[in-house]
Every structure is written in structure tokens, then in C-alpha cells.
Interface confidence: low
């Protein structure tokens, strides 16, 4: 999906109002210095592309992020403010919607959410620079 035509201000508002709180709650008990940010993005559409990938595409060591509340809110936000965005374009649709019972949060998942927080912060900073 091409995120170029999204309403970035609305997405930022939704992130600051709710998604960020859920990401921080998920990370509670860990220090921001526990993980190094290895994923970055260069502009707003690129940031959303990376955010979608990290949020919805299961990885071998962290397969369950898509059912978390922050992921559900991210999905709703993208669908609302990105014209033509379709849930069927998310590779992890099945994993996301089935909401299998949550397993204990693994260190690898915490690392992935830490990366997500970094991408969202980058998205906000990029937004500020563009205005």
C-alpha cells in the first residue's frame, strides 16, 4: 500500500491520544535503553510502511503483536485516514483477526515494540519538519 495520500495530522493525533499509551503500557517494566533502535524511516509514508510491517507481519520470534490493542488501534487509524487502505492488504490479517490467546510477552516482542516506538517518534518528528 502507498501511504502517500494519508491524512498524517489525523494519524498523528490518534497516535498521541491512544496508540502511544498502549505501546508504552506494553513496554512497561523495561528501560528505553534496553534495546537499540535498528529500524528507521526517512519520510512519513516510509515510516507508515515500516510501522505497518513491524506491527502486522509476524516474525519467527514474535508472532503475536498483531492482536495487541495498539495494533488494533493502528489498523483502525490507517483504515480511517489512508484512502483505499484495505485490511486484506495486510499480510498478517489472519493472525491479527483470530486473536489467539495471548502468550507471555517475549523479549523479542519487547524489542520489536521498542522499534515501533522509535518509528512512531520518527513519524512525528518528520511531520513536524514538514509543516
Amino acid at each position: 500500500y502507498d501511504f502517500t495520500n494519508c491524512d498524517f495530522q489525523k494519524i498523528e493525533a490518534d497516535y498521541l491520544r491512544t496508540i502511544s499509551k498502549d505501546l508504552i503500557t506494553y513496554m512497561s517494566g523495561t528501560k528505553s535503553t534496553d534495546f537499540n533502535n535498528t529500524v528507521s524511516c526517512s519520510n512519513r509514508p516510509h515510516c507508515l510502511t515500516e510501522i505497518q510491517s513491524l506491527t502486522f507481519n509476524p516474525t519467527p520470534r514474535c508472532a503475536s503483536l498483531a492482536k495487541e490493542m495498539f495494533a488494533r488501534k493502528t489498523k483502525a487509524t490507517l483504515a480511517l485516514w489512508c484512502p483505499g487502505y484495505s485490511e486484506t492488504q495486510i499480510n498478517a490479517t489472519q493472525a491479527m483477526k483470530k486473536r489467539r490467546k495471548r502468550k507471555v510477552t517475549t523479549n523479542k516482542c519487547l524489542e520489536q515494540v521498542s522499534q515501533l516506538l522509535g518509528l512512531w517518534r520518527r513519524f512525528i518528528r518528520t511531520l513536524l519538519k514538514k509543516q
Partner: antibody, heavy 122, light 108 residues
């Protein structure tokens, strides 16, 4: 307990207007997406409209677009449906329904009101 | 727009298993929700997200979803299960909530 109570139904002539209300209690209304769903006599359920938890987004079924307006007053825990240019085919029981999570669209409807009957007839 | 197709009626003998289907193009990629509606009453959510059950719904109610068909299964059918059942999805391409036409379940 969690409850939704609709009001404002009645008999109205074609072309006229009617305003439905839905009073919510027992839950934090401002954090939930809300919908209107209707059911014509002897027919199935038809989704009508949705409003985002903070009122920033609304969306309508094609059959009512441009005629109906969904609003909410979070300070009063109230959902409204302003129905203008009513037609005979709008005759139905109108239910308000809550989405159980922050996302007003993606979730199922876990709480429904008892419904209010709207009859459009000359 | 997206269309959900349900059989108008399904019958089941007491104690037996009833299966109500909901057909839609690639419905397996969507989250399907099911409602029970008894005459003169508001609908009640019985299954959400394909197979999850609200806490107030008995385990006899279950759901599945893959390919082009979602299914609501009611095991050990009882007279109290007689009702209309509706499936529902959100169609992301149109941002519309879509209901199936409903299925009348009769417990013989």
C-alpha cells in the same frame, strides 16, 4: 449495568424529519464508537451509521447518505440520529449499538438498545 | 458492495448440532461476528472475531471462518436456541458494516 435506551420514534409523514436519541449508562461512553442499525418489519438487520468515539469521524450507509446525520454529546452520554427527508422505506425499528473496543468500525456490537419504532406513512 | 449470503432457514432436532453458514467473497480474510435475535427483542452478540465467545454465551456456540464461508455451530440444540441468526463483517473497501440476510433456526 451497561445500558442503551433509544427514544424519539413515532409516526411521521414522508418528507418530514425525526430525531432519535440514545442514552447510554453504565460505561464510559466517550471511549466507544457508536452505531445505528435498523430493521424493517419482518426483514433483516441493516447498518445505518457510525460515529467515532470522539465524534471526529462519521460514515453512513448509501441508503441514508445525505439525509441522516449521526452526532453524539459525550458530556451527556447521548447519541443522536437526525433523520430528514424521510421515506416509506425508512420505516423500521432503530437500534443504537456499541462497539466494544476503541475502534468503532472493526469490532462487533456487544451492547444494543431495545430499539425505537419509526413509521413513515401518509 | 460486499454481500453476505445466509440460508433462510435451518432446522435441528433437540440435542443435535446446527450449522449456519455465511458466504462471502474471501470472507476468511475478514473478522465475522454472529448475532442471535429472538422475536420482539434486540440482537445479542453470540460469537465475535470468527470464533470468540462473549462471557455470557454458553460454550455450545462456536464459530469458524475460512475461504468463502464462515460457520456458526450450535451444539446440543435447545428450544431456547430458536431465533434468527445474523452474520456481520466490516467491508474495508467501502468502510461499510454489512449484515447477512439472516437465518431462522428451528428446533424441531
Amino acid at each position: 449495568q451497561m445500558q442503551l435506551v433509544e427514544s424519539g420514534g413515532g409516526v411521521v409523514q414522508p418528507g418530514r424529519s425525526l430525531r432519535l436519541s440514545c442514552a447510554a449508562s453504565g460505561f464510559t461512553f466517550r471511549t466507544y464508537g457508536m452505531h445505528w442499525v435498523r430493521q424493517a418489519p419482518g426483514k433483516g438487520l441493516e447498518w445505518v451509521a457510525v460515529i467515532w468515539y470522539d465524534g471526529s469521524y462519521t460514515h453512513y450507509a448509501d441508503s441514508v447518505k445525505g439525509r441522516f446525520t449521526i452526532t453524539r454529546d459525550n458530556s451527556k452520554n447521548t447519541l443522536n440520529l437526525q433523520m430528514n427527508s424521510l421515506r416509506a422505506e425508512d420505516t423500521a425499528v432503530y437500534y443504537c449499538a456499541r462497539s466494544p473496543q476503541w475502534e468503532s468500525i472493526f469490532e462487533a456490537f456487544d451492547i444494543w438498545g431495545q430499539g425505537t419504532m419509526v413509521t413513515v406513512s401518509s | 458492495s460486499y454481500v453476505l449470503t445466509q440460508p433462510p432457514s435451518v432446522s435441528v432436532a433437540p440435542g443435535q448440532t446446527a450449522r449456519i453458514t455465511c458466504g462471502g467473497n474471501n470472507i476468511g480474510s475478514k473478522s465475522v461476528h454472529w448475532y442471535q435475535q429472538k422475536p420482539g427483542q434486540a440482537p445479542v452478540l453470540v460469537v465475535y472475531d470468527d470464533s470468540d465467545r462473549p462471557s455470557w454465551i454458553p460454550e455450545r456456540f462456536s464459530g469458524s471462518n475460512s475461504g468463502n464461508t464462515a460457520t456458526l455451530t450450535i451444539s446440543r440444540g435447545e428450544a431456547g436456541d430458536e431465533a434468527d441468526y445474523y452474520c456481520q463483517v466490516w467491508d474495508s473497501s467501502s468502510s461499510l458494516v454489512v449484515f447477512g440476510g439472516g437465518t431462522k433456526l428451528t428446533v424441531l
